[in-house]
Interface confidence: low
């Protein structure tokens, strides 16, 4: 029998009646077009729904949009289109929701061709009221909020002007022309690239990187010969054209662009690309594309300055610039990432790291699964996860892998069990320990979501036929109950629950189709009565994360410390609640070689924890560029992994000496940088 359908599964008592009393239908008075949904604020219950419908006429397309608001997590909606004067809203800009709980919303309207500028509707009270504002420019991008101050907005215009507002979009000022890309940094700083000659495209590789720290009063040029730039964690990256040829290299700054160092990464040619896969304040995962149209590259992990890099994973699947990669941060357990590699025979395999890219392994075969046809040995195979690449290839995969920081250890994903990803219809698998072990959770493809910090998992079968059944589990996917939420099946389009997985409400979106019309409909189900009581101390159990060998004192040590979590027992049917905070208890570990990456010029042979010198660098002085000076590195091959907190134990020595030589690598050295004021 399928998982969760055998006799020992305990039933949740009277759940049909409890759910029926908490199922709310809303039929939208709309012809079916497109629908977009945004949550406004955290734990506010406010949802905005924008429906748009295009009527193709002979000469032009006539558009109509409607705006709906719910303040009870989607149980009831009110048509508030009149608050935006029945204006057609441009869906490509989406709804720009302010950071944190600012309650701010910006909608960008469609305006007629001859108008001087665009039009926006602004709300700062969680969409209860809107103010119409005509813009002195036509926006090219969605309004971007400063992460530090939601009153500060920036936008690019269709004429490549950089516009800033200091009063939440009421008044706008063009602070610079000829801008290609602009991003907010920390402390309300704006970074942007400018072109001098023709256009962004024509000047690619000859752009300048600018910074303003006072919203456009003064500027500083912080880089030239720029191809592109990016921000990740506390790092500012720029890819810079080399002097002699068409290659480019990554430079990195940790002081907002005042000083730069050349990253110890391979240079790339015109057809190649760099991509920041993940970044935090400690380190960066960087993908470097392989020459040629291979569809793969190499993942490198940085040191704490973003300068020295270690090779982390070869043949990493990443199709083209801005293309597809399966790289996934498993947010439910520290240090865990999943991605795909393209093997020599062009099959795709899933790899997982538990130590922030130090080592990668295949996923363990689920106990309750057999190896499929891709497996050469029917007893030995692995789980392979479907992610962005599979979705882009139109495989029968409705969702990417899912994990939530407050649902500790839980990872849900579509997958197949064999030697490589299979094109067969996938099943859904779950891990409750952050990816170390897996179990088949549901047969066939499903949509899934996590509620109440993991207390409930909800799933809906992915089907081309109309559906009216939802499945839910209160024991992390071991046992499933099915609930018929409507008599009349609907064409399902999506599951929506409040971001953060703390809610107990789930909205099922779809449309009904009759002979004459089709209409949007949503069903919101509140699971509060299924989880009747609040969880108590006895409902939780202690769980040691990353535990692989309980006999070992260093068991669970990852990045120099271990963490014990209080986790809800699978058998407990109770509410974690909206205020649930993950309880964890860390303890520091002794340092071992596993706590060190191989330094510049060193590598780790497979299945060995020792770092050995790269043959081509043997006997050479290790010199590299740091803050525009040449440095000499004295090392025995190790450097501490960024974020590693181990103490004591082994302690390899590392020393960096300043050679007092300049090495600006054609990049602006700090003393040559210019400033100007408006």
């Amino acid at each position: 029998s399928a998982p969760g359908e055998d006799e020992e599964c305990g039933r949740v008592r009277d759940f049909v009646a409890k759910l029926a009393n908490n199922t709310h239908q809303h039929v939208f008075d709309d012809l079916r077009g497109s629908v977009s949904l945004s949550w406004v604020g955290d734990s506010t219950g406010v949802i905005l729904v924008l429906t748009t419908f295009h009527v193709p006429l002979v000469i032009m397309t006539f558009g109509q949009s409607k705006l709906y608001r719910s303040e009870d997590y989607g149980k009831n909606f009110k048509d508030i289109t009149d608050l935006i004067n029945n204006t057609f809203i441009r869906t490509e800009f989406g709804m720009a929701i302010g950071p944190e709980n600012s309650g701010k919303v910006v909608l960008t309207a469609e305006v007629s061709g001859g108008s001087r500028g665009g039009r926006i509707f602004r709300s700062s009270d969680f969409a209860k009221n809107f103010v119409q504002t005509d813009l002195p420019f036509h926006p090219l991008t969605q309004m971007m909020y400063s992460p530090q101050n939601s009153d500060y907005l920036l936008a690019l215009s269709t004429e490549n002007g950089l516009w800033v507002s200091k009063n939440f979009g009421g008044k706008w000022e063009e602070i610079h022309k000829a801008v290609c890309l602009a991003k907010w940094g920390s402390d309300n700083t704006i970074f942007f690239t400018t072109y001098a000659n023709g256009s962004c495209k024509a000047d690619l590789g000859a752009l300048e990187l600018w910074r303003t720290s006072d919203l456009g009063k003064s500027f500083k040029t912080i880089g030239v010969k720029i191809y592109s730039f990016g921000l990740g964690g506390r790092f500012l990256f720029a890819s810079v054209m080399a002097d002699k040829d068409t290659t480019r290299r990554i430079h990195v700054s940790t002081d907002q662009g005042d000083t730069w160092s050349m990253a110890q990464l391979p240079s790339v040619g015109q057809e190649q690309f760099y991509s920041i896969l993940a970044a935090n304040d400690d380190m960066v995962f960087m993908h470097v594309d392989e020459p040629g149209d291979t569809g793969f590259g190499t993942i490198f992990t940085s040191d704490d300055r973003g300068i020295v890099y270690s090779k982390s994973l070869d043949r990493h699947l990443y199709t083209t610039t801005g293309g597809e990669t399966d790289f996934t941060n498993v947010t439910s357990l520290r240090g865990v990432y999943i991605t795909s590699v393209l093997s020599e025979d062009n099959s795709i395999q899933t790899m997982i790291t538990f130590d922030q890219g130090g080592r990668w392994t295949h996923l363990r075969k689920p106990e309750n699964s057999e190896c499929d046809a891709t497996a050469k040995n029917k007893n030995e195979c692995s789980l392979h996860i479907h992610a962005s690449y599979s979705i882009s290839q139109k495989l029968n995969v409705p969702m990417a892998p899912l994990s939530e920081p407050n649902a500790v250890g839980i990872v849900i994903a579509h997958g197949s069990v064999g030697d490589a990803i299979s094109v067969m219809v996938p099943d859904v698998y779950i891990s409750d320990d952050g990816g170390y072990s897996w179990t088949k959770m549901l047969e066939g493809p499903h949509y899934y979501t996590i509620l109440d910090s993991g207390g409930i998992i909800v799933a809906i079968e992915h089907s081309s036929r109309p559906i009216n059944v939802i499945k839910f589990s209160t024991d992390e996917g071991q046992c499933w109950q099915t609930y018929t939420f409507t008599r009349d099946p609907i064409y399902f389009t999506g599951l929506a629950s409040e971001p953060g997985a703390r809610s107990m409400n789930i909205s099922i979106w779809g449309f009904t189709e009759s002979f004459l019309t089709s209409q949007w409909v949503s069903y919101t189900i509140d699971f509060k009565d299924i989880l009747e009581r609040n969880c108590e101390e006895k409902d939780y159990t202690i769980w040691l994360a990353h535990s692989t060998d309980p006999e070992d004192y260093e068991d669970g040590c990852i990045l120099g410390y271990k963490e014990q979590f209080l986790r809800l027992r699978k058998s407990s049917v109770c509410q974690n609640g909206r205020d649930y905070v993950v309880t964890k208890q860390p303890s520091i570990c002794l340092c071992s070689l596993e706590d060190f990456l191989c330094d510049f010029g060193y590598y780790r042979p497979e299945n060995d924890s020792k770092c050995v010198e790269q043959p081509e660098l043997k006997g050479h002085d290790l010199e590299f560029c740091l803050y525009g000076r040449e440095e000499h590195l004295t090392t025995n091959g190790y450097r501490k992994i960024p974020g590693d907190k181990c103490q004591g134990g082994v302690n390899p020595v590392r020393e960096v000496k300043d050679l007092k030589k300049k090495c600006t690598s054609n990049f602006l050295s700090p003393e040559k940088q210019n400033s100007k004021s408006n």
């Epitope: 309980p550 006999e551 070992d552 004192y553 260093e554 410390y561 208890q585 860390p586 303890s587 520091i588 570990c589 002794l590 103490q647 004591g648 134990g649």
Partner: antibody
């Protein structure tokens, strides 16, 4: 019932050596870390050494490193403490304790070691 | 190394009294703390582990509390058999796993 029985204590000359043993019973010995703790006459408890369940990892306070060696024989359910270069300040009752990680949950009755000429 | 400061070093109380012993630690040990009871001529006995969890078979009048750097052992109603010396010990991170200097609880 968990039982830990220390033996091997006695009088030893300064600079001399002694090997203490601890026989464990009533639990699965090879899945627990084990520790030695000592108590000088009229004084408080002092942690001496710890060994991981498989015997791979050993831990000592800096002042005892190099003189004391903790070991175990999981086949015999036995824990050992080798004391070398005995000093007067090593005079104490030595306890062996089961050490699952966040506490020492069972203790032996102790064995007295006296370092004196 | 982490320093443990146990107070008071000695304490006189009567049967039925509520008694509190504190252990202050030189850095955050994230509740990695145990309490032991030792009677004269006997080996120590575990009372509380992970700061707040009572060990098996320990009477409910013994309870642990605290977090960060400050921890407390409370005996809600002192019984004759509770007169003994009490020790705290941390298990935070790497050794040494130091003990407090002890609190001697005597009959008033």
């Amino acid at each position: 019932e968990v039982q830990l029985v220390e033996s091997g204590g006695g009088l030893v000359q300064p600079g001399g050596s002694l090997r203490l043993s601890c026989a464990a019973s009533g639990f699965t010995f090879n899945i627990y870390g084990m520790s030695w703790v000592r108590q000088a006459p009229g004084k408080g408890l002092e942690w001496v050494a710890t060994i991981s369940s498989g015997g791979i990892y050993t831990y000592y306070p800096d002042i005892l490193k190099g003189r004391f060696t903790i070991s175990r024989d999981n086949a015999k359910n036995s824990l050992y403490l080798q004391m070398n270069s005995g000093r007067a300040e090593d005079t104490a009752v030595y306890y062996c304790a089961r050490h699952p990680g966040g506490a020492m949950d069972y203790w032996g009755q102790g064995t007295l070691v006296t370092v004196s000429s | 190394d982490i320093q443990m400061t146990q107070s008071p070093s000695s304490l006189s109380a009567s049967v039925g009294d509520r008694v509190t012993i504190t252990c202050r630690v030189s850095e955050n040990i994230y509740s990695n703390l145990a309490w032991y009871q030792q009677k004269p001529g006997k080996s120590p006995k575990l009372l509380v582990y992970a700061a707040t969890n009572g060990a098996d078979g320990v009477p409910s009048r013994f309870s642990g509390s605290g977090s960060g750097t400050d921890y407390t052992l409370t005996i809600s109603s002192l019984q004759p058999e509770d007169f003994a010396t009490y020790y705290c010990q941390h298990f935070w991170g790497t050794p040494p796993w130091t003990f407090g200097q002890g609190t001697k609880l005597e009959i008033k």
